[in-house]
């Protein structure tokens, strides 16, 4: 049962796992939510009636029942994490705490103008998790407008006190919006000879970089495979850092894989959740249910839907026992990793999917998908934008797609002809064309960025970057789509969708309603073959039904390509150019993005 | 109106190389892809490559890849194939196309063609 | 490559005929499919494309008919000038291919 409100004047008593210092019973909830073992929390806020060592402490907690013994006591904030919970989770955490001093290890001090400067440094310094900042009102001369940058082995401050004129924060990393280099690839052969700040069992390199990502400590990792010629060593999954923030030593190492910390992706925080299937693997821990099920993704969802389950292994029935049900084992661990994994025995194993809301914006679940028919409903595609031009009249000029709250990314070729961005207008939310009244509120463009290698679609490097004039407030209807990353390159997608207001055939008038085509993927070698008087590089990709009928059409130009991939939607392409529309067998080919996240970094966190 | 005006005949010696000509008029020569294809005597149509003068990319047939060389002159509106190390099966007409549609398709528009003969 | 096989390789008939030219493609290719006429000396010329469309200046008696592999050259009612090679080519996938032609002559 998920519940959100906080119990004032409440105790849970005993089921301690460990406590760390929050500025609030707020952030102590997130904590809680993001902790692998904690379902409850007391939070002890400032009251003079309680020992002020007392205050600021979040006591992480855990019950098998899923619930603890209430007692009053004053100052005493308790509730439930939100993994219970079905609604969309997020470490992010933009507020700014005044009078209080977070206390971590100062590893940098440095002048700043102001708390959000303070809190924008800490946010692009790789080491820190928090920050001090004290005011210009500060009575010590030579500490005002100091900006310490903190850091400590959870994530949390080791103490905080209250101290006037003086205000302290977290590191927006979690918010997606660090400028730091974000370092997708998987490095094979590879050991990181570094200091471990912890280590844990996982199956796969893949894994091992998730669980570094929400490590507070982790900047990169080593793991060793399955095939490590030290046995003990198999599977393990060492987290390290190092003062500089990268790997002072690389050692080629066979069997070992290496890669960093996706902390600092600002375009797409990894998913946190596991969704892989472990075929003849084992994971061992603590058991919480031996419960039996038809197969390996029912295992996943009663493991899914148990609170306290972390990871699981099925084993398949044996013949025709027990109505053809395999066994399906509910365990969990201390840290939510498995304390052995084990090879050969038979068995399937994965992980809950209960943490796959631990993401950013971009990853929030939307609307389901309505089956069928072309015509899409509000909502169902909220990153999808209409971009407008006013000269000389007002028309429907491309699509494009939401990345961040002041971006859109669309293609180049759709502003041939156009000088200037005071002409442009981009509407969100919008399903149908026919909302757009004149005092319908718009989005102003600031800036049209278009890629300088860009010459025509046909040739590539057909992208572009919108920079808005004002901020997008995220909403049901208007929120980003996630930018696919470097390490998903060789993934398969199943699901992608391509929508737009465009013709649906040649010659057609632009749609009132979003169109939407559910398309699948064809191999770039297939689509060379379909254009033999066009080079289709690596840096597009194709789609398109063999026996056409449903493709992207003129006025598509610029919209999104987007597939879903475990649970979460990608940016996958931009609409770029093809034949006609949906002519059978000649797919539509879009700009691929993957291959300009890079750029897009670049070009959205330049200063 | 559409017109593809190519080069005369020629006649070559076992080893040696051929240049034909192919003038476009009458269009965006850029728009279109201009597509080889040549004939031997009594024989049936073979497809050699295609170039796409918009962009100067080229296409070849697996079966002349090492020997066939497509080039366009976007100025001049002429495109050109060479053919080296010529030998006596290459004798043939050979014909420039411009395709139908901008992306491949049919081929609507033929030149006259050029008749190469090789003979030592 | 796709192979297009085209029958009969010759034909007889009069004027006034209904004649029909079959093409088999080795595998599917969809609707990209074109009939080109060609007469001794001459550059061929496209008749019809994506299988049934006509293409400009075209007379009616010429009509295209078939799907993924099998497709059909009709004429309806045969003139003195209809009497030359055809030839199918398919577009689907790239080299282009062309049948080995259908020499139409008169009875």
């Known amino acids: 049962e998920c519940v959100t409100q906080l119990l004032k004047d409440t105790c849970f008593e005993g089921g301690d796992i460990t406590t760390v210092f929050t500025p609030s019973a707020k952030y102590c909830q997130v904590v809680c939510t993001y902790h692998p073992r904690c379902l409850l929390f007391t939070f002890t806020a400032e009251s003079p009636s309680e020992d002020p060592t007392r205050w600021f402490t979040c006591v992480l907690k855990d019950s098998v029942t899923e619930t603890l013994p209430r007692v009053n006591r004053t100052a005493a904030i308790s509730g439930y994490s939100f993994k219970q919970c079905s609604h969309q989770i997020s470490a992010c955490n933009k507020d700014i705490y005044v009078d209080l001093d977070m206390k971590g290890i100062n590893y940098n001090s440095s002048v700043a103008k102001s708390a959000q400067e303070c809190q924008e440094r800490c946010t692009d310094d790789v080491h820190c998790h928090f920050f001090t900042y004290a005011t210009r009102q500060f009575p010590s001369l030579e500490h005002r407008n100091i900006c310490l940058l903190k850091h400590t082995q959870t994530g949390t401050p080791t103490r905080i006190t209250k101290l006037d004129k003086v205000v302290s924060g977290f590191s927006l990393k979690s918010c997606a919006l660090s400028n730091l280099a974000c370092i997708r690839d998987i490095f094979p052969n590879t050991v990181f000879a570094d200091s471990n700040i912890d280590s844990v069992m996982a199956p796969d390199a893949f894994v091992c970089g998730r669980i570094c990502t929400h490590h507070p400590g982790c900047l990169f990792f080593t793991f060793f495979s399955q095939e490590w010629p030290k046995e003990s060593q198999r599977n393990l999954c060492l987290l390290k850092t190092s003062e500089s923030g990268l790997p002072s030593t690389r050692i080629k190492k066979s069997k070992a894989l290496s890669g960093f910390s996706l902390q600092s992706c600002r375009h797409s925080i990894p998913v946190f959740c596991h969704s892989s299937f472990y075929h003849d693997t084992d994971f061992l821990g603590e058991e919480l249910d031996i419960v039996a099920a038809k197969s390996h993704e029912a295992c996943q969802k009663l493991c899914t839907n148990a609170v306290r389950c972390q990871f699981f292994t099925y084993t398949p029935a044996q013949a025709s026992c027990n109505e053809g049900k395999g066994k399906c084992y509910l365990k969990l661990s201390s840290n939510g990793s498995p304390t052995k994994i084990l090879h050969g025995r038979g068995g399937i194993s994965g992980y809950t999917l209960r943490l796959c809301k631990m993401d950013n914006e971009c990853t929030t679940k939307i609307k389901p998908r309505i089956v069928g028919g072309t015509a899409s409903v509000r909502g169902e595609w909220p990153w999808q934008v209409t971009l407008h031009t006013t000269s000389p009249t007002q028309r429907h000029l491309c699509g494009g797609s939401i990345i961040g709250n002041q971006w859109i990314l669309t293609a180049a070729h759709c502003f041939y002809g156009v000088e200037s961005p005071k002409i442009l207008r981009v509407y969100s939310g919008i399903l149908n064309q026919s909302e757009i009244k004149e005092d319908t509120s718009f989005f102003g463009v600031q800036e049209i960025i278009i890629h300088d290698q860009y010459k025509m679609a046909e040739s590539g490097y057909d992208i572009a970057l919108l920079k808005l004039e004002t901020t997008v407030n995220y909403t049901d209807s208007q929120r980003p789509i996630c930018l696919p990353s470097k390490g998903d390159r060789n993934v398969i997608y199943t699901d992608c969708w391509v929508t737009g207001w465009g013709y649906r055939k040649l010659r057609d008038k632009i749609q009132n309603t979003l169109q939407k085509a559910k398309i699948p993927l064809v191999t770039n070698e297939e689509c060379q073959k379909r254009y033999r008087g066009h080079k289709i590089t690596h840096k597009m990709i194709c789609a398109g039904y063999r026996e056409g009928g449903k493709d992207a059409c003129k006025g598509d130009s610029g919209g999104p390509l987007s597939c879903k991939h475990n649970e979460v939607w990608h940016l996958v392409g931009i609409t770029s150019w093809g034949e006609g529309c949906a002519q059978r067998e000649r797919p539509g080919v879009y700009t691929n993005v993957v291959e300009y996240v890079d750029w897009i970094l670049e070009k959205t966190q330049a200063v | 109106q559409v017109q593809l005006v190519q080069s005369g005949a020629e006649v070559k010696k076992p080893g040696s190389s051929v240049k034909v000509s192919c003038k476009a008029s009458?269009?965006?020569?850029?728009?279109?892809?201009i597509e080889w294809v040549r004939q031997a005597p009594g024989q049936g149509l073979e497809w050699m490559g295609v170039?796409?003068?918009?962009?100067?990319?080229?296409n070849y047939n697996e079966n002349f890849k090492d020997r066939v060389t497509i080039t366009a002159d976007e100025s001049t509106s002429t495109a050109y194939m060479e053919l080296s190390s010529l030998r006596s099966e290459d004798t043939a007409v050979y014909y420039c196309?411009?395709?139908?549609?901008?992306?491949?398709?049919?081929?609507?528009?033929w030149g006259q063609g050029t008749t190469v003969t090789v003979s030592s | 490559d796709i192979q297009m096989t085209q029958s009969p390789s010759f034909l007889s008939a009069s004027v006034g005929d209904r004649v029909t030219i079959t093409c088999k493609a080795s595998q599917s290719v969809s609707n990209d499919v074109a009939w080109y006429q060609q007469k001794p000396g001459k550059a061929p010329k496209l008749l019809i494309y994506?299988?049934?469309n006509r293409y400009t200046g075209v007379p009616s008696r010429f009509s295209g008919s078939g799907s993924g592999t099998d497709f059909t050259l009709t004429i309806s009612s045969l003139q003195p000038e209809d009497f030359a090679t055809y030839y199918c080519?398919?577009?689907?996938?790239?080299?282009?291919?062309f049948g080995q032609g259908t020499k139409l002559e008169i009875k």
């Open positions: 080519q398919q577009d689907y996938s790239s080299p282009p291919t």
């Open positions: 994506y299988i049934s």
């Open positions: 170039i796409n003068p918009g962009s100067g990319y080229t």
């Open positions: 009458g269009y965006a020569f850029s728009n279109y892809l």
């Open positions: 196309a411009r395709t139908y549609g901008k992306y491949g398709g049919a081929m609507d528009f």
